[in-house]
């Protein structure tokens, strides 16, 4: 594994409470806007300062969101995914996939750039 970069994929359930300005993040992806090659999944593109997601601290830019309030985000158009978040209510449960860069054994910093590596 010398000099090789691998990725550790973990999943987490994140419960957010919608703040005064909403959930506080942006997304990319969808069947009409593939962000990662051969993957029409929904990814977090930006966490907004002082928003609900930033204050909670667990959701990270580059995370893949698998479901919202138990509803799967597979095979959704981009706008349909956006609408799902906007209509998700006050308490929002996100199932997310984190992708951590691992180099020479120990866990390193989160990989930058295109999540496809």
């Amino acid at each position: 594994m010398n000099g090789r970069v691998d990725y550790l994929v973990t999943e987490e359930e994140i419960n957010l409470t919608r703040g005064p300005s909403g959930l506080g993040f942006n997304i990319v992806g969808g069947t009409d806007q593939q962000y990662v090659s051969n993957d029409s999944g929904i990814y977090v593109s930006r966490i907004k300062e002082n928003g609900a997601a930033a204050l909670d601290g667990r959701l990270q830019e580059g995370d893949k969101i698998l479901s919202v309030n138990g509803q799967d985000l597979k095979n959704l158009l981009h706008q349909d995914a956006v609408d799902l978040f906007r209509n998700a209510g006050y308490a929002v449960s996100l199932r997310v996939q984190h992708r951590l860069q691992v180099q020479n054994g120990p866990i390193g910093h989160r990989g930058e750039g295109d999540p496809s590596g």
Epitope: S21, G24, F25, N26, I27, G30, S45, R46, F85
Partner: nanobody, 125 residues
Framework: EVQLVESGGGLVQPGGSVRVSCVSS????????IGWFRQAPGKEREGVSC???????YYVDSVKGRFTISRDNAKNTVYLQMNSLKPEDTAVYYC????????????????????WGQGTQVTVS
């Protein structure tokens, strides 16, 4: 370094037309929402038009049917074509960019943007 540069403003007669452009550098437009905003003297900055990350266009009611937003990803440029201009359209016009789509509001909301240009003056007189 991310940069947005507006151009194309100027002095226009009422009823006239002008096209303003916003050229981006330091990132590619794919996956970005781009908004046009304006600020008249003594007034707050307001959303005029925007195009979301999948190319859907939005307009504030006061410019619907007169303004048209378009994007050319190959040129990293977004345009705002303004027709049938009125004196009340006089303002500094700014473009702004945001990576992805906000899950909270449409791209007409200026609080969602983190990159801004310096603006270009449009005077209708």
């Amino acid at each position: 370094e991310v940069q947005l540069v507006e151009s194309g403003g100027g002095l226009v007669q009422p009823g006239g037309s002008v096209r303003v452009s916003c050229v981006s550098s330091g990132f590619i437009l794919d996956y970005y929402a781009i908004g046009w905003f304006r600020q008249a003297p003594g007034k707050e900055r307001e959303g005029v038009s925007c195009i979301d990350s999948v190319g859907r266009a939005y307009y504030v009611d006061s410019v619907k049917g007169r303004f048209t937003i378009s994007r050319d990803n190959a040129k990293n440029t977004v345009y705002l074509q303004m027709n049938s201009l009125k004196p009340e359209d006089t303002a500094v016009y700014y473009c702004a960019a945001d990576f992805g789509s906000s899950v909270d509001s449409t791209c007409l909301n200026n609080q969602q943007y983190n990159y801004w240009g310096q603006g270009t003056q449009v005077t209708v007189s």
